[in-house]
């Protein structure tokens, strides 16, 4: 699994809605694959972490002044939707086919 | 200044192009304000860090399993351009009015 010593990458993160208290309004699924972005943004930043110019600059400054400036951070750069069956304000079960921004599609250094 | 104990925010980061070796092709400015996103993404995530649903979910999972899952990360969510005078491939001084993605406009939790 990707830790602080490995490069920025997408790793599995199964989220159980009961664990986060969302089972009170989400009926299904019981859990889903959210993914997590893990690992470091080390110099030189590879193309696959799609670094912004600012991330490149910050990485170079961190190399020069590691105690003053942090590295860029490995974060979701593109998110995917999931489908959820949830209770609306009136408690009526409703199917949301695209519940946006719930799962990581891509990770990158920002 | 914003440290790990403070909430995610934009802080000053003056970048000198000589420090990062870019003075070989950037003629002016000699330095600029890049800003840096610093601080933690603590529960509950405030509106001003414009959290995605995934960041909210990850924050809740981190609360439940702090050793298994990391917090969301404070990163630039919007970048601004700067103007630069640089040497093109032929060594000709050229003004790039909008050199995109060089300075942080907004920070958020992702």
């Amino acid at each position: 699994s990707a830790g602080a010593g490995s490069h920025c990458q997408k790793t599995s993160l199964r989220v159980n809605f009961e664990d986060i208290g969302w089972d009170s309004w989400i009926i299904a699924p019981k859990e889903y694959e959210a993914y997590e972005c893990k690992g470091g943004c080390f110099f030189p930043l590879a193309d696959d972490v799609t670094p912004t110019k600012h991330a490149i600059v910050q990485t170079l400054v961190h190399l020069k002044f590691p105690t003053k400036v942090g590295k860029a951070c490995c974060v979701p750069t593109k998110l995917s939707p999931i489908s959820v069956l949830y209770k609306d304000d009136m408690g009526v079960p409703t199917l949301k086919y695209h519940y946006e921004g719930m799962s990581v599609a891509e990770c990158g250094c920002r | 200044s914003a440290g790990a104990g403070s909430h995610c925010q934009k802080t000053s980061l003056r970048v000198n192009f000589e420090d990062i070796g870019w003075d070989s092709w950037i003629i002016a400015p000699k330095e600029y304000e890049a800003y840096e996103c610093k601080g933690g993404c603590f529960f509950p995530l405030a509106d001003d860090v414009t959290p995605t649903k995934h960041a909210i979910v990850q924050t809740l999972v981190h609360l439940k399993f702090p050793t298994k899952v990391g917090k969301a990360c404070c990163v630039p969510t919007k970048l601004s351009p700067i103007s630069v005078l640089y040497k093109d491939d032929m060594g000709v001084p050229t003004l790039k009015y909008h050199y995109e993605g060089m300075s942080v406009a907004e920070c958020g939790c992702r």
Epitope: I27, A28, Y32, S83, A105 | -
Partner: antibody, heavy 120, light 107 residues
Framework: QVQLQQSGAELVRPGTSVKVSCKAS????????MEWIKQRPGQGLEWIGV????????NYNEKFKGKATLTADISSSTAYMQLSSLTSEDSAVYFC?????????????WGQGTTLTVSS | DIQMTQITSSLSASLGDRVTISCSAS??????LNWYQQKPDGTVKLLIY???SLHSEVPSRFSGSGSGTDYSLTISNLEPEDIATYYC?????????FGAGTKLELK
Amino acid sequence: QVQLQQSGAELVRPGTSVKVSCKASGYAFTNYLMEWIKQRPGQGLEWIGVIHPGIGVTNYNEKFKGKATLTADISSSTAYMQLSSLTSEDSAVYFCARRANWDLYYFDYWGQGTTLTVSS
Amino acid sequence: DIQMTQITSSLSASLGDRVTISCSASQDISNYLNWYQQKPDGTVKLLIYYTSSLHSEVPSRFSGSGSGTDYSLTISNLEPEDIATYYCQQYINLPLTFGAGTKLELK
């Protein structure tokens, strides 16, 4: 193994209704969404809608609202699609398909299709 | 609705050929694209999801690529059982929409 067995071909009169069935086996029927797709002769595929079999909640393509009604019977692990006020435009092959997962937007198993012919 | 266009409605190829089937969307669909195969007997199978992920039990001669509005399905070494009609499908927006299909025939 996962199987979706659809009802046989239908020849019906214009203005009538028809109910197509899709019997699921080899998996937990209530844990997966069931989707329905239309294919007219020599044409592409059209998404009709989706049902959560466990609760009966549906989403429809606007184009098929009032035309298609999706239901499910948990006891027999069967999904149904009723088509009403039939016209020649409804003559097509209709497929049921299992949605692979809540966080994956693809159909991993399909029925064999039910041919509907609307003719006077 | 997002329109999915498969410009080539039919394609002739020989066994062993490398075949590429294209699909374009009326707007950026961010790789939210699947490919399905429909055999002459009408049976439909999933081949590829999310642009390039091969579904289980699908032979590795099938591959998918693309981004933005332009996508393609490639069969690297055409086999007799690959004779079928291939459909692309987007899922970034409702309603889900499919291409009109590309019928692959033997030369």
